[in-house]
């Protein structure tokens, strides 16, 4: 009785269960009652990452420097190449097919998380007591100057974009 289902790492072809090709190899010819599945290793620039019956290996991803990409991890016969972005850039998607410059946090916002090759800068609004007066991809919100510790008084209140202005205390004569 011909099988209707096959074991793990097998596939059904013309009423016969054949072994799948292991990762790193492609299918050349299905098995027969007398011959095992014919598989061939993928070439140097190709890969297959699963047990498969593919007749063609997949081409390794190309990390195009014109798109700001560089190789993070070279591909093998069983894994794809992993791309990342050059310094100052990050991926536009999870598959990292192109790069864009990291965004800067505008005045009034500070860097919560510095960008990496795969993630953009995360900004946060400066809370009360903190400010940022620059557009930066690295600088966090800075605390207002403490006038008291300098024996000074606040002459101008701080905002999320400006520091407080300290001045001398009024002395009574």
């Amino acid at each position: 009785e011909p099988p209707t289902a096959c074991r793990e790492k097998q596939y059904l072809i013309n009423s016969q269960c054949c072994s799948l090709c292991q990762p790193g190899q492609k299918l050349v010819s299905d098995c027969t009652e007398f011959t095992e599945t014919e598989c061939l290793p993928c070439s140097e620039s190709e890969f297959l990452d699963t047990w498969n019956r593919e007749t063609r290996c997949h081409q390794h991803k190309y990390c195009d420097p014109n798109l700001g990409l560089q190789v993070q991890q070279k591909g093998t016969s069983e894994t794809d190449t992993i791309c990342t972005c050059e310094e100052g850039l990050h991926c536009t998607s999870e598959s990292c097919e192109s790069c864009v410059p990291h965004r800067s946090c505008l005045p009034g916002f500070g860097v919560k998380q510095i960008a990496t090759g795969v993630s953009d800068t995360i900004c946060e609004p400066c809370p009360v007591g903190f400010f940022s007066n620059v557009s930066s991809a690295f600088e966090k919100c800075r605390p207002w100057t403490s006038c008291e510790t300098k024996d000074l008084v606040v002459q101008q209140a701080g905002t999320n974009k400006t520091d407080v202005v300290c001045g001398p205390q009024d002395r009574q004569r």
């Epitope: 013309n14 010819s29 299905d30 098995c31 027969t32 009652e33 007398f34 011959t35 095992e36």
Partner: antibody, heavy 117, light 109 residues
Amino acid sequence: QVQLVESGGGVVQPGRSLRLSCAASGFTFEKYGMHWVRQAPGKGLEWVAVISYEGTKKYYADSVKGRFTISRDNSKNTLYLQMNSLRAEDTAVYYCARDTSRGHDIWGQGTMVTVSS
Amino acid sequence: EIVLTQSPGTLSLSPGERATLSCRASQSVSYSYLAWYQQKPGQAPRLLIYGASSLATGIPDRFSGSGSGTDFTLTISRLEPEDFAVYYCQQYSDYPPFTFGGGTKVEIK
């Protein structure tokens, strides 16, 4: 390169025995089923026998069943055909061929067996 | 047993002409497991077509196969001098035995 080379043919009297060999090279012999196919002088191709890659399954043509035995030694990359009780009608060129789902994709050059008194 | 009948027995043609060879099976050939082989005098057969219509490795594309069930055809679009030979069909779906057709000889007219 992928190659099959038959040997062991010759002239033999009716009723006698002969053993043919087929030496394989250039491929993983132990993964492939193997066939013997013969061709009588001036005639067409006749399938004789097949053996599975590990040697457990064997099938024969009715014309040779009980007289011929197909076997293999994977450690020597060699296929055999033991031919007993030979008859005049067994006179032919004997080819070994590789089994695939694409048919017989590789053939040897053949070895001539003549059964004559 | 599947009996394969090839026709014609002999085909006389000139180089550059089209050759059409027929192979008829006594019962349906499952999965189109039918192959075509070429054999020249003193040589072993050579696989041309498998699965009724797939071209074997290294075979020129002037050779093509078609058909399913019980009727199969080998076509040589433009005969080259080296194509004059004997052609055999073979079924490998229902066995034992693996059966061959009687052959078609393509000769120079």
